[in-house]
C-alpha cells in the first residue's frame, strides 16, 4: 500500500526544504523565507524559531532545519532544545523568585546554577571534618577521629602494622 501511495502521491517527491503546493497543482515549492521543512513530502513549511531577547542564535534557520537558540550571557538554558533561559547566580548562591540569594549556613553551591545543598555529614561515615565548608564549597572529610591520636598529624604517613585493639579504617 505504501509503495502504491507513493507512486500516486506527487507530494512524496518533494524533498526537505520544499513543500507540496496545493495552490500550484501540487508542485514542490521552496519554503518561504523564515520557514523550513526537515523532511520530504510535507504540505507546509514550519515557521523558524526566533532567538530574541533572552535568547540568542546558536545556529541559523535554513530551509531544511530549524534555528537553534542558547541564552544570552548571564543566563543558562533549561529544557529540551533550550526552551527556557534561567538567570545565573554566583557560586555560594541559589536562585529564588526573589532573585539570587546566599546559601544558608550549612549549605553550599559550587556552581552558577542549581540549589544550595547541605554540607556532607562526615560523622555519618565515621570521619572527622578536615576542612570546614563554606557557601561555595562542601566540607572535606578526613580520617576518623580514632585515627587522629593526640599530637598526630592530620595527614598521616604510611602506618606500621596496627596495634591490637585498633580497628581497620
Amino acid at each position: 500500500f505504501e509503495r502504491t501511495r507513493s507512486l500516486q502521491d506527487p507530494c512524496s517527491n518533494c524533498p526537505a526544504g520544499t513543500f507540496c503546493d496545493n495552490n500550484r497543482n501540487q508542485i514542490c515549492s521552496p519554503c518561504p523565507p523564515n520557514s523550513f521543512s526537515s523532511a520530504g513530502g510535507q504540505r507546509t513549511c514550519d515557521i523558524c524559531r526566533q532567538c530574541k531577547g533572552v535568547f540568542r542564535t546558536r545556529k541559523e534557520c535554513s530551509s531544511t532545519s530549524n534555528a537553534e537558540c542558547d541564552c544570552t550571557p548571564g543566563f543558562h538554558c533549561l529544557g529540551a532544545g533550550c526552551s527556557m533561559c534561567e538567570q545565573d547566580c554566583k557560586q555560594g548562591q541559589e536562585l529564588t523568585k526573589k532573585g539570587c540569594k546566599d546559601c544558608c549556613f550549612g549549605t553550599f553551591n559550587d556552581q552558577k546554577r542549581g540549589i544550595c545543598r547541605p554540607w556532607t555529614n562526615c560523622s555519618l561515615d565515621g570521619k572527622s571534618v578536615l576542612v570546614n565548608g563554606t557557601k561555595e564549597r562542601d566540607v572535606v572529610c578526613g580520617p576518623s577521629p580514632a585515627d587522629l591520636s593526640p599530637g598526630a598529624s592530620s595527614v598521616t604517613p604510611p602506618a606500621p602494622a596496627r596495634e591490637p585493639g585498633h580497628s581497620p579504617q
Partner: nanobody, 123 residues
Framework: EVQLVESGGGLVQPGGSLRLSCAAS?????SYWMIWVRQAPGKGLEW???????????YYVDSVKGRFTISRDNAKNSLYLQMNSLRAEDTAVYYC????????????????SGQGTTVTVSS
C-alpha cells in the same frame, strides 16, 4: 503566535523618570509570572523585577529597589515598569519576558521575550 512587544524607552536625564510597557498577545496573560530583564552595553543580561499572576507578589534586584515599580493590567494584557530616579547605570536594553510553566516552583526559566526597548540615562 505568542508575542511580547516593549515600548516606552528613550533618552532621559539622571534623576528623571520613564514608564516602560509590554503588550502581550497569543497566550493567557493572567496565567503567567512576568519578568523584566535588562542588558547594559557590553554586559550580560540582568534580572530586574518579576510579578506573579495577580500582582500580589513583586520582587526586585537590590540596585533598583525603591526606584522601580513593576505592575500589570491583566484586562489589558500589559506589563509595566515605572522607573524613577534614573541613574547612568540604568542605561540598558530592557526586555519583557514570560515565566515558564513551573516558574517559582522549581525553576525560574523564561520561555518568551520581546525585542527590547532602549533606555539611555545621560545628561
Amino acid at each position: 503566535e505568542v508575542q511580547l512587544v516593549e515600548s516606552g524607552g528613550g533618552l532621559v536625564q539622571p534623576g528623571g523618570s520613564l514608564r516602560l510597557s509590554c503588550a502581550a498577545s497569543g497566550f493567557t496573560f493572567s496565567s503567567y509570572w512576568m519578568i523584566w530583564v535588562r542588558q547594559a552595553p557590553g554586559k550580560g543580561l540582568e534580572w530586574v523585577a518579576n510579578i506573579n499572576q495577580d500582582g500580589s507578589e513583586k520582587y526586585y534586584v537590590d540596585s533598583v529597589k525603591g526606584r522601580f515599580t513593576i505592575s500589570r493590567d491583566n484586562a489589558k494584557n500589559s506589563l509595566y515598569l515605572q522607573m524613577n530616579s534614573l541613574r547612568a547605570e540604568d542605561t540598558a536594553v530592557y526586555y519583557c519576558a514570560r515565566g515558564g510553566d513551573d516558574y517559582s516552583n522549581s525553576h525560574y526559566g523564561m520561555d518568551v521575550s520581546g525585542q527590547g526597548t532602549t533606555v539611555t540615562v545621560s545628561s
